[in-house]
Interface confidence: low
């Protein structure tokens, strides 16, 4: 069976939207009105991995683009990147681990933990207009909580 996917946008706990910042980078900033059209629409695919009531493995692709968020080591540090894939082969049920995030729901907020690097989360800065990154701390200065808005396909 084909992998189940849904289209959505994400906003951080400060209500910052995620937008493209160059071909392989996302950043977070407050958008209003028509500018909201600039926010990235994700294709969230439900993939194979460890699952529980509040933890669901997903892959986050960019709608209509052959790009997926992935987690890799750079200079010995877990790093978030946008990775190009062959659209003929993706999405798939058994995604490579670097593409997999554990979607964790807590108090109506979502966290996205890297399956490759446990306890590392998709994060944004408090500051406006800064890159989305992989952070190793929760509850600190950086933001790891998101809300999801469904987008009709």
């Amino acid at each position: 069976a084909p992998v189940r996917s849904l289209h959505c946008t994400l906003r951080d706990a400060q209500l910052k939207s995620l937008v493209m910042s160059g071909p392989y980078e996302l950043k977070a900033l407050h958008l209003q009105g028509q500018d909201l059209e600039q926010q990235v629409v994700f294709s969230m695919s439900f993939v194979q991995g460890e699952e529980s009531n509040d933890k669901i493995p997903v892959a986050l692709g960019l709608k209509a683009k052959n790009l997926y968020l992935s987690c890799v080591l750079k200079d010995d540090k877990p790093t978030l990147q946008l990775e190009s894939v062959d659209p003929k082969n993706y999405p798939k049920k058994k995604m490579e681990k670097r593409f997999v995030f554990n979607k964790i729901e807590i108090n109506n907020k979502l966290e996205f933990e890297s399956a490759q690097f446990p306890n590392w989360y998709i994060s944004t800065s408090q500051a406006e207009n800064m890159p989305v990154f992989l952070g190793g701390t929760r509850g600190g200065q950086d933001i790891t909580d998101f809300t999801m808005q469904f987008v009709s396909s």
């Epitope: 937008v19 028509q34 500018d35 600039q38 990154f133």
Partner: antibody, heavy 121, light 112 residues
């Protein structure tokens, strides 16, 4: 082909006003942030102002803040720069410039040919 | 504001020669999270509007000849033209895009 055509330049008295226009074609205007950049005679380039796709984010250089207003009309594919309280140091070629990555990366990939503004009595 | 300084202000070379020009910023343009330097180079030929050559310090814009190379990180950057051609006669500007853009004063390249 991307085309940006500026108009509205000319001779203005000090303290006067002028409105520049930029007609865009060859790309989806409403999907790109836009800038005005100026160049005084025999001088370097100076960024003037930026406007986001839906006009909700605007930024100005300190030298023009409070005097210049950037705006856009997406259905008409046109960018504007309203200039007031003009000074001699505003004399320059004014370029309309497209922003490469839509939100505020300020990588300017296409430039118009410019329109010349001279502030003099 | 971030201040950009370019040197030399002008230089004259023969065609076929290699040329380098420098750009220094008053603060680092390296974003440690993205590992990108937010610096671009533009070429302005006489009587023309500027043209984007390089962004992120070293990424060549599509269609730009590979004799143009950008390098550097942090506060010190270099534009190198591997083998100067007559059509490279121009003023070259660096520009930081780390925050509101500021340009360097330019380096004028003349052909002997």
């Amino acid at each position: 082909d991307v085309q940006l055509v500026e108009s509205g330049g000319g001779l203005v008295q000090p303290g006067g006003s002028r409105k520049l226009s930029c007609a865009a074609s060859g790309f989806t205007f409403s999907s790109f942030g836009m800038h005005w950049v100026r160049q005084a005679p025999e001088k370097g380039l100076e960024w003037v102002a930026y406007i986001s796709i839906g006009s909700y984010t605007v930024h100005y250089a300190d030298t023009v803040k409070g005097r210049f207003t950037i705006s856009r009309d997406n259905p008409k594919n046109t960018l504007f720069l309203q200039m007031t309280s003009l000074r001699s140091e505003d004399t320059a070629m004014y370029y309309c410039v497209r922003d490469d990555y839509d939100v505020t990366d300020y990588t300017m990939d296409y430039w118009g040919q410019g329109t010349s503004v001279t502030v003099s009595s | 504001d971030i201040v950009m300084s370019q040197s030399p202000s002008s230089l004259a070379v023969s065609t076929g020669e290699k040329v380098t020009m420098s750009c220094k910023s008053s603060q680092s343009l390296l974003n440690s999270r993205t590992r990108k330097n937010y610096l671009a180079w533009y070429q302005q030929k006489p009587g023309q509007s500027p043209k984007l050559l390089i962004y992120w310090a070293s990424t060549r814009e599509s269609g730009v000849p590979d004799r143009f190379t950008g390098s550097g990180s942090g506060t010190d950057f270099t534009l190198t033209i591997g083998s100067v051609q007559a059509e490279d006669l121009a003023v070259y500007y660096c520009k930081q895009t780390y925050n509101f853009p500021t340009f360097g004063g330019g380096t004028k390249l003349e052909i002997k």
